[in-house]
Interface confidence: medium
Amino acid sequence: RKIPKVGHTFFQKPESCPPVPGGSMKLDIGIINENQRVSMSRNIESRSTSPWNYTVTWDPNRYPSEVVQAQCRNLGCINAQGKEDISMNSVPIQQETLVVRRKHQGCSVSFQLEKVLVTVGCTCVTPVIHHVQ
Amino acid sequence: GITIPRNPGCPNSEDKNFPRTVMVNLNIHNRNTNTNPKRSSDYYNRSTSPWNLHRNEDPERYPSVIWEAKCRHLGCINADGNVDYHMNSVPIQQEILVLRREPPHCPNSFRLEKILVSVGCTCVTPIVHHVA
């Protein structure tokens, strides 16, 4: 069975690379930039013409244990009068991220990487109109 | 597997022998989902706060390609297709986890890294500061 490569680039394996069992990757769990902070404009989820709410999912067997998901509040967008305009659409903006999942039995633990799709916010778009013949 | 501290029989992480690296299955769950935002939707063009997508490629990282959004305008596009500077286009940022090859160029040895990406833009009412 061929082991899938992570990434698309072929690497010459330097002599200094640590030995890794087949089918596995070695993962250092000390995190680079662990304490960096998101510096978005204040309250954009409420000030947006396509406002959204946040919900937090918590799973202690996942890193990060908290994943925040956004949900658009409206189908339409908020106009200058503060009313919903259904001739426009609020749509979710999504981003993939990696999480590490832990599976444990007593003192024994295994780890699995997983891609998850996070909805980060919403934007207001002009709808695509399909004309029926 | 490796050891999780659970009671006096398990080691603690301040021991010099405590593993700071773990072996992880190479098969990433959901790895084949579409990662090209240009292909997955055209919101970046249809938005009232449109953005351009810039390809950031780094072979020492997984995923090697990440798309960064840059808002096209300071203002937002109004119903006439013009930029309205009474509103602001602002980026929506998200912290994501990626894998960084460590040591460099090693095919199957990684470290987790948090990076900040701009995913898209949204149109907001500006915060107006009144000068006394």
Epitope: I31, P64, V100 | P5, S13
Partner: nanobody, 119 residues
């Protein structure tokens, strides 16, 4: 030396209440998330609740939501778990665990306190 000492366990009837305490020492308590974890007889570990450093954010496993409350007193270096409307399935050894220095690891545990819910 880091120490976590749980207390407050015991035998209680279904529907009853208990308050578990965990006294922490040997580290800067206010700098860490803290957890309650339980292990039922013959079962694996179950993460019950987490509380962030300043106590402002708490998380609970679905099976205890609305019945258990995690809290902390940073001035007293203490962690608490108020358990109401107890059920037979809450019977377990309850451990207090110090937050993770490394992601996905609990680096210190207490010795545990046994909670038995039975009529």
């Amino acid at each position: 030396e880091v120490q976590l000492v749980e207390s407050g366990g015991g035998l209680v009837q279904p529907g009853g209440s208990l308050r578990l305490s965990c006294a922490a020492s040997g580290f800067t308590f206010s700098s860490y998330s803290m957890y309650w974890v339980r292990q039922a007889p013959g079962k694996g570990l179950e993460w019950v609740a987490e509380i962030k450093q300043d106590g402002s954010v708490q998380y609970y496993v679905d099976s205890v939501k609305g019945r258990f409350t995690i809290s902390r007193d940073n001035a007293k270096n203490s962690l608490y778990l108020q358990m109401n409307s107890l059920r037979a399935e809450d019977t377990a050894v309850y451990y207090c665990a110090k937050g993770e220095i490394l992601p996905l690891y609990f680096d210190y545990w207490g010795q545990g306190t046994l909670v038995t819910v039975s009529s």
